[in-house]
């Protein structure tokens, strides 16, 4: 007879997700010179560790200690890049300007990026069916600490002219909810960070409007301003030209504003 | 299952060199970065090197550099040594062998080995 | 480099015998990220090595429970609980926590 288990209102863990996040550790431990001295094994069982026989709703910043510890990385810190709702774009422009690095780019970023999970109380099991949503069940789930752990971490590196990239097609173009607007902003460290620059994504080919005035960018602008850090914003009316002028810099349609 | 199937038997003169393949399957070869080794009845086994398939970059045992230069053509799934100005020293059973999932420098899966007799 | 000191040399065993081989590394083996990395591998007259035991303890998958490693420091044990035809061959130590990777002279486990 099947026991009875906890029905959350969330997918189930990511299939295959111990082999992937081993997978991808290999990976990236190939890709990263700077990061072979990283046992991947430790750190899967580190990240087991952080959310295996714990409820998943019960769930803290100190279970993710472990994994935080074994992924800890140098990042350039004056090379940040933070996104919020445009994360695909984010990840092009990375893979193109070598140099500047998301949270995905960086090991722990990347075993998770795209990935649920969570367990049982009391059992060694992974749920495969379902794990606790964020906004029916509860905020502590496994994902959600991780990725505010993360995120907290990642801010707090950061220095000098943090870059941030905004989707300009979304009613909030800066949404206090989302990871950026409840964490990072609130974690960037005045005394490190000069600047925070937002890159403004437009949607509509035709969109000419300054997104830069909008109301919830305004607001962006009070938070950092208030933090002692300066704001600057910039529009990116065609996304494709801006990605292209990236790799082709020295293209003369690339002197006029994009 | 992962395979690592190595080149023929080699009888070279002094003096001349001679390139040795490690062709892999059976798992991503791309990601795993591929291990050199020479057991002779002298030493037994000498670890010569690893190259990392992604970017292609090495490292050498000191000992090897200037002997042994390890490449890689990802197309084909294939890791390359060239054993350089071959001696009766050379003469030895050479391996490939996969990085282990856990750690870059451990290894797991071995190929067959290639033996390489150096003789005038 | 690491000098990886593998004794006996030789050592004879009856079947269903326990067998012991040690590895003496010159140095120690912990890396800088808190692992050991102290490999076994059992190498069959005519066949490349195959991995039986990393990281001092671990068995690598398919290895049967009658293989076990333990040790610290610069004193590590390879132990057969109950030797079996197909366990013949030459044993051999290694260590990838240092580069250049090192191993053992080896040792050849034979009947009796």
């Known amino acids: 007879v099947p026991r009875w288990r906890q029905q959350w209102s969330g997918p189930g863990t990511t299939k295959r997700f111990p082999e992937t996040v081993l997978a991808r550790c290999v990976k990236y431990t190939e890709i990263h010179p700077e990061m072979r001295h990283v046992d991947c094994q430790s750190v899967w069982d580190a990240f087991k560790g952080a959310f295996i026989s714990k409820h998943p709703c019960n769930i803290t910043e100190e279970d993710y200690q472990p994994l935080m510890k074994l992924g800890t990385q140098t990042v350039p810190c004056n090379k940040i890049l933070l996104w919020s709702r445009i994360k695909d774009l984010a990840h092009q422009f990375t893979q193109v300007q070598r140099d500047m690095f998301t949270l995905e780019d960086t090991l722990l970023g990347y075993l998770a990026d795209d990935l649920t999970w969570c367990g049982e109380f009391n059992t060694s099991k992974i749920n495969y069916q379902s794990c606790p949503d964020w906004r029916k069940d509860c905020s502590n789930n496994p994902v959600s600490v991780f990725w505010k752990t993360v995120s907290r971490r990642f801010a707090e590196a950061a220095c000098d002219v943090v870059h941030v990239m905004l989707n300009g097609s979304r009613s909030k173009i800066f949404d206090k909810n989302s990871t950026f607007g409840s964490v990072e902003v609130h974690n960037l460290q005045p005394e490190k960070v000069q600047t925070l620059e937002a890159w403004v994504i437009h949607g509509g080919r035709e969109d000419s409007r300054d997104l830069c005035q909008d109301p919830t960018i305004k607001e962006l602008e009070s938070i950092i301003s208030k933090r002692n850090i300066q704001f600057s914003c910039k529009n990116i009316y065609r996304p494709d030209k801006f990605l292209q002028c990236v790799k082709n810099p020295e293209d003369s349609s690339c002197t006029s504003e994009i | 299952q992962v395979q690592l199937l190595q080149s023929g038997a080699e009888l070279v003169r002094p003096g001349v060199s001679v390139k040795i393949s490690c062709t892999g399957s059976?798992?991503?070869?791309?990601?795993?970065?591929v291990h050199w080794v020479k057991q002779s009845h002298v030493k037994s086994l000498e670890w010569i090197g690893v190259?990392?398939?992604?970017?292609?970059?090495?490292t050498y045992n000191q000992k090897f550099t200037g002997k042994a230069t390890m490449t890689v053509d990802k197309s084909s799934s294939t890791a390359y040594m060239e054993l350089a100005r071959l001696t009766s020293e050379d003469s030895a059973i050479y391996f490939c062998?996969?990085?282990?999932?856990?750690?870059?420098?451990?290894?797991?899966?071995w190929g067959q080995g290639t033996s390489v007799t150096v003789s005038s | 480099d690491v000098v990886m000191i593998q004794t006996p040399l030789s050592l004879p065993v009856s079947l269903g015998d326990q067998a012991s081989i040690s590895c003496r590394p010159s140095q120690s083996l912990v890396h800088s990220n808190g692992n050991t990395y102290l490999n076994w591998y059992l190498q069959r007259p005519g066949q490349s090595p195959k991995l039986l035991i990393y990281?001092?303890?671990k068995r690598f998958s398919g290895v049967p429970d009658r293989f076990s490693g333990s040790g610290s420091g610069t004193d590590f044990t390879l132990k057969i609980s109950r030797v079996e035809a197909e366990d013949l061959g030459v044993y051999l130590c290694s260590q990838s926590t240092h580069v250049p990777l090192t191993f053992g002279s080896g040792t050849q486990l034979e009947i009796k």
């Open positions: 190259i990392s398939p992604y970017y292609g970059d090495t």
């Open positions: 990281k001092v303890s």
């Open positions: 062998a996969r990085r282990f999932e856990g750690f870059y420098y451990s290894m797991d899966y």
């Open positions: 059976g798992y991503s070869f791309t990601n795993y970065a």
